[in-house]
Interface confidence: low
């Protein structure tokens, strides 16, 4: 089976992880999407999901996680605000499409949160000021209870697109794989 790769992000407590999952509009715009954590030897656990059907640009907040699905751009934005050391772990974005198994991304996110503040370029010193800029009209969505056993034992089939070049070889209507665009501050 193809081995899933990981991208490691090291952030400080109080900062915000900001991930954008780039998906095929034609196929997945209204599909329910979710943010999952993967613990060693366990099934992926869904931490937050969009509504079903997913609503355009409508923030869904579950605790410190905010999901926003931008249908026009084929982007699911996932934010984990006010990061804590205990948030460290392995995460992934998935698209639900019952009764089929969820579609998963090829690069999982290995998040490492440490104490203290960083002033390095690419991290935002003022990120804690953004933590509370959450729209008041957020909703909580019920997530499907099932998770796919495949995520523990084998990787999904290899995408036809290069992970670092979203859509570079993607047909508008015939694609079943999704590609993640990682961003964080």
């Amino acid at each position: 089976a193809t081995k899933l790769t990981e991208e490691k992000y090291e952030l400080k407590e109080g900062q915000t992880l900001d991930v954008k999952c780039d998906y095929t509009l034609e196929k997945f715009a209204s599909s329910q999407k979710a943010w999952q954590i993967i613990r060693d030897g366990e099934m992926p656990k869904t931490l937050a999901c969009t509504e079903r059907p997913s609503k355009n640009s409508h923030p869904v907040q579950v605790g410190r996680i905010i999901l926003e699905d931008y249908h026009d751009h084929g982007l699911l934005r996932v934010r984990m605000v006010n990061l804590q050391v205990e948030d460290s772990g392995l995460y992934q974005c998935v698209i639900y499409q019952p009764p089929k198994e969820p579609h998963m991304l090829f690069d999982r996110i290995r998040l490492v949160v440490t104490k203290g503040f960083s002033g390095t370029p690419g991290s935002n010193e003022n990120s804690t000021q953004n933590v509370y800029k959450i729209p008041p009209t957020t909703t909580k969505a019920l997530c499907p209870l099932y998770t796919s056993p495949r995520t523990v034992t084998q990787a999904p089939p290899k995408s036809t697109a290069d992970v670092s070049t979203p859509d570079s070889e993607i047909n508008l209507t015939n694609v079943t794989d999704i590609i993640r665009v990682p961003v964080f501050n």
Epitope: D18, K20, D22, L25, E26, A29, S30, N56, Y70, H71, D72, H73, G74, L75, G122, N124, N130, S164, T165, P166, D167, S168, I170, L172, V181, P182, V183, F184, N185
Partner: antibody
């Protein structure tokens, strides 16, 4: 008013690396709403997309140039940069930096004035 | 890559007359899920960078005169200048942003007859 300004050498020798910097003023490059891109235009010809970057450093490169291109960002200076290695005369062009919207599938709404880079020995 | 083909290459129109530029994409840039065409139009005057005129195929950018309009869907698009003014002399480019890499048309040069 947002302004973008390209800077860098106007003459580069073949096989060397072209390096350009785009300085953004009138707005923060760290805004979570925008991507930033490089586009080039050979003299008398059309426009070609080179690549784009998010303030965090997440990049997209045109596959036709991917093996030679590096785009980076320096949020502390409100700048992003382009490096194009192993240049040839075919890389002679006006290089523009531009602001994009929130997502890869978006137009360029603010452009720098452009800088002409000539590849010649 | 999606190939964008513009026609004509150049166009000479009398002041006050209508100018029409065509752009054809090698595959559809319309997504049925949101019924949006991922196409933009730019104007480039000599010695200047391109200026955004139209996005989503027909939405005018803020500050663009209403004599500029965009139309079309799927693979065939048109930029129309309803009443050509002297300041409209420029090269016009279409660009698709449905699939990366973004690609531009070859440009149409608009001159005064």
């Amino acid at each position: 008013q947002l302004q973008l300004q390209e800077s860098g050498p106007g003459l580069v020798k073949p096989s060397e690396t072209l390096s350009l910097t785009c300085t953004v003023s009138g707005g923060s490059i760290s805004s979570s709403s925008y991507y930033w891109g490089w586009i080039r235009q050979p003299p008398g010809k059309g426009l070609e997309w080179i690549g784009s970057i998010y303030y965090s450093g997440s990049t997209y490169y045109n596959p036709s140039l991917k093996s030679r291109v590096t785009i980076s960002v320096d949020t502390s200076k409100n700048q992003f940069s382009l490096k194009l290695s192993s240049v040839t005369a075919a890389d002679t062009a006006v290089y523009y930096c531009a602001r994009l919207g929130d997502g890869y599938r978006i137009w360029a709404d603010y452009w720098g004035q452009g800088t002409l880079v000539t590849v010649s020995s | 890559d999606i190939v964008m083909t513009q026609s004509p290459d150049s166009l000479a129109v009398s002041l006050g007359e209508r100018a029409t530029i065509n752009c054809k994409s090698s595959q559809s840039v319309l997504y049925s899920s949101n019924n949006k065409n991922y196409l933009a139009w730019y104007q480039q005057k000599p010695g200047q960078p391109p200026k955004l005129l139209i996005y989503w195929a027909s939405t005018r950018e803020s500050g663009v005169p209403d004599r500029f309009s965009g139309s079309g869907s799927g693979t065939d698009f048109t930029l129309t200048i309803s009443s050509l003014q002297a300041e409209d002399v420029a090269v016009y480019y279409c660009q698709q942003y449905a699939l990366t890499p973004y690609t531009f048309g070859g440009g149409t040069k608009v001159e005064i007859k």
